[in-house]
């Protein structure tokens, strides 16, 4: 029954979607952004305990004009899932509870078999989400690859499919800057560089504050970070523009310490106006 | 950026509203941006290692506008925008590190002081 006039069950199981998702709530998932290649998902390693894998399987005729050719009932329809060491099976969810398949995994949760129906009827379509634990992902993990294989005892040639995600470690650093003041004025008389004794001789004062905040783990485990400021010290013809008097880093060194940046500013060794600090 | 006058359409700026502006407003046409990224200025990069960076750090940089250059080069200019840029870089053996929003642009507006008469 369900195998057409020739009594041979020629199914057409297709894995039409296999994409990684972020789990928003128990049954709500959001697809991960895609890499520029359009086929690889981007997974940010930033404390997500699980990742979802959205799977959509259909059993529809390959040619709607010749529906009798295939798309028959798929008996003992299954999806076999092979997980990498970095991912472990943790559960299955479906938007429609009636579509939720029975999924069983081996002892170390690296291999999963999901029963899609016996049979998975002609015209059927099922969407569900595998919930995969990310606890095995380390900073050395660069890619996630899950191998997926549909299986049935009905007549159909089936080939493995891979779902891929590129893993990156997103440093949750934010940077913001302000100038004090936001507007400057120039006036007076032209004076040569050698006439400058004190910073007050140079022109209007300006202070820049650049704040960096780290919402994640300490950077010590990941490498060394640098805060850089591109300081426009001269105009295109080589004349001074903004003269750098003092550069100090606060908070990147430990309590109360002021970090040293390179190169050193105030190369003309002008007298510092301490009232401005 | 800050404008001394009322707000205008983007790209249009006015000098501070003083009737005795040293250069006539007809002459004061240009709005110039001095920005190393556009090649209109040259930059020195101050680089500060964040040795024990757990939560936050603030870079404080004090500077002075080089008055003489502005008097010589820009006294007939309507307004100048000076751009300072800052970013974070991370050196790591980890290949798949990614920084998002790791740069910022800080503009400052510069005008000929309307309160002062320029001495030649």
């Amino acid at each position: 029954q369900g195998c057409g006039e020739d009594k041979i069950c020629q199914s057409n199981l297709q894995l039409v979607r296999a994409r990684f998702c972020t789990r928003v709530s128990d049954t709500e998932f959001q697809p991960l952004p895609m890499d520029v290649d359009g086929t690889t998902a981007l997974f940010a390693l930033s404390g997500q305990p699980v990742i979802g894998l959205e799977l959509m399987v259909t059993n529809l005729p390959s040619d709607p004009a010749q529906p009798q050719a295939d798309g028959d009932d798929a008996h003992e329809a299954q999806l076999l899932v092979m997980l990498p060491d970095s991912l472990h099976y943790s559960g299955v969810r479906a938007l429609d509870p009636a579509e939720k398949p029975l999924c069983l995994s081996n002892e170390n949760a690296s291999h999963v078999e999901c029963e899609l129906g016996n049979p998975m009827k002609r015209g059927a379509q099922v969407t569900f989400y595998l919930i995969l634990s990310t606890s095995g992902i380390s900073i050395e993990t660069t890619e996630l690859e899950v191998e997926l294989l549909l299986a049935t005892i009905s007549e159909q040639e089936l080939h493995p499919v891979s779902a891929r995600a590129r893993v990156f470690i997103e440093l949750p650093l934010s940077i913001a800057g302000m100038a004090i003041p936001q507007q400057l004025f120039f006036s007076g008389v032209v004076r040569g560089e050698r006439a400058m004794q004190s910073e007050r001789d140079v022109g209007s004062k300006v202070k820049y504050e650049v704040t960096v905040s780290n919402q994640g783990q300490s950077l010590r485990t990941l490498g060394s970070a640098f805060l850089n400021i591109m300081w426009p010290h001269e105009i295109a013809n080589g004349k001074w523009l903004l003269y750098p008097m003092q550069v100090e880093l606060e908070g990147g060194q430990g309590p109360g310490q002021k970090g040293l940046c390179s190169p050193r500013p105030n190369i003309l060794h002008l007298d510092v106006d301490s009232r401005d600090r | 950026e800050l404008e001394p006058p009322e707000q205008q359409e983007p790209g249009e700026r006015q000098e501070p509203s003083m009737s005795w502006w040293p250069v006539s407003s007809a002459e004061k046409k240009k709005n110039i941006t001095l920005d190393c990224a556009r090649g209109t200025a040259n930059c020195v990069v101050f680089s500060c290692p964040l040795y024990s960076f757990d939560r936050a750090a603030v870079l404080h940089v004090w500077g002075r506008l080089w008055n003489s250059t502005f008097l010589e080069e820009y006294s007939a200019v309507k307004s100048l925008e000076v751009i300072v840029r800052a970013n974070i870089t991370v050196k790591s053996s980890i290949k798949n590190l990614m920084l998002r929003d790791a740069s910022t642009v800080i503009p400052v507006m510069v005008y000929l002081d309307p309160m002062a008469v320029v001495a030649e």
Epitope: M178, G251, K258, R275 | P16
Partner: antibody
Framework: EVQLVESGGGLVKPGGSLRLSCAAS????????MNWVRQAPGKGLEWVSS????????YYADSLKGRFTISRDNAKNSLYLQMNSLRAEDTAVYYC????????????WGQGTMVTVSS | SSELTQDPAVSVALGQTVRITCQGD??????ASWYQQKPGQAPVLVIY???NRPSGIPDRFSGSSSGNTASLTITGAQAEDEADFYC???????????FGGGTKLTVL
């Protein structure tokens, strides 16, 4: 929820001392310059003091003449104001306020704590 | 130290437009920020920078700047806008903050 809660206000005699505290929650306290602002009864707002992220840069209103000391404990997410040699004119509601990173603006304020200096 | 001057009181008819001004030498160099304070409550930031509104502040509030004067404009004033409004900026030293004396807005 981003919140600042002041405490430590009360009645104190002229010449006395008081230490105000401000407990921060809901944000990375150590990333922000913090301020104290006060408001005498029926009067306007007056800036008192500011402290940078780890306390390297501290500023006070000129009128305070070294009687007040601002400090912070980032491990406890707390801001403090030690007030000595108090005078009747220091009677006010004292607010702690967070300064936005990229602007000179106080975007988060506490509800204030009342300090009354009276004999 | 710098001073910022505000009109002590301003009134506006319901639904009309009102402008509150703030004058001071430091405003030639610094943006003003504006705060609304209702009786018994802490101040609330309404405008900062060139003309930025924090989230939750209605778009009837706007800011502008000209010379040494900053202005807060409320277009279509509502009854709930009745409050004291304060401007602030840094003083000319760049290290201190100065507040204006405040403007009491009455919505008629």
């Amino acid at each position: 929820e981003v919140q600042l809660v002041e405490s430590g206000g009360g009645l104190v005699k002229p010449g006395g001392s008081l230490r105000l505290s401000c407990a921060a929650s809901g944000f990375t306290f150590s990333s922000y310059t913090m301020n104290w602002v006060r408001q005498a009864p029926g009067k306007g707002l007056e800036w008192v003091s500011s402290i940078s992220i780890v306390g390297n840069y501290i500023y006070y209103a000129d009128s305070l003449k070294g009687r007040f000391t601002i400090s912070r404990d980032n491990a406890k997410n707390s801001l403090y104001l030690q007030m000595n040699s108090l005078r009747a004119e220091d009677t006010a509601v004292y607010y702690c306020a967070r300064r936005k990173w990229e602007h000179d603006a106080f975007d988060i304020w506490g509800q204030g704590t009342m300090v009354t200096v009276s004999s | 130290s710098s001073e910022l001057t505000q009109d002590p009181a301003v009134s506006v008819a319901l639904g009309q437009t009102v402008r509150i001004t703030c004058q001071g030498d430091s405003l030639r160099s610094y943006y003003a920020s504006w705060y609304q304070q209702k009786p018994g409550q802490a101040p609330v930031l309404v405008i900062y920078g060139k003309n930025n509104r924090p989230s939750g502040i209605p778009d009837r509030f706007s800011g502008s700047s000209s010379g040494n004067t900053a202005s807060l404009t409320i277009t279509g004033a509502q009854a709930e806008d009745e409050a004291d409004f304060y401007c602030t900026s840094r003083d000319n030293s760049g290290n201190h903050v100065v507040f204006g004396g405040g403007t009491k807005l009455t919505v008629l």
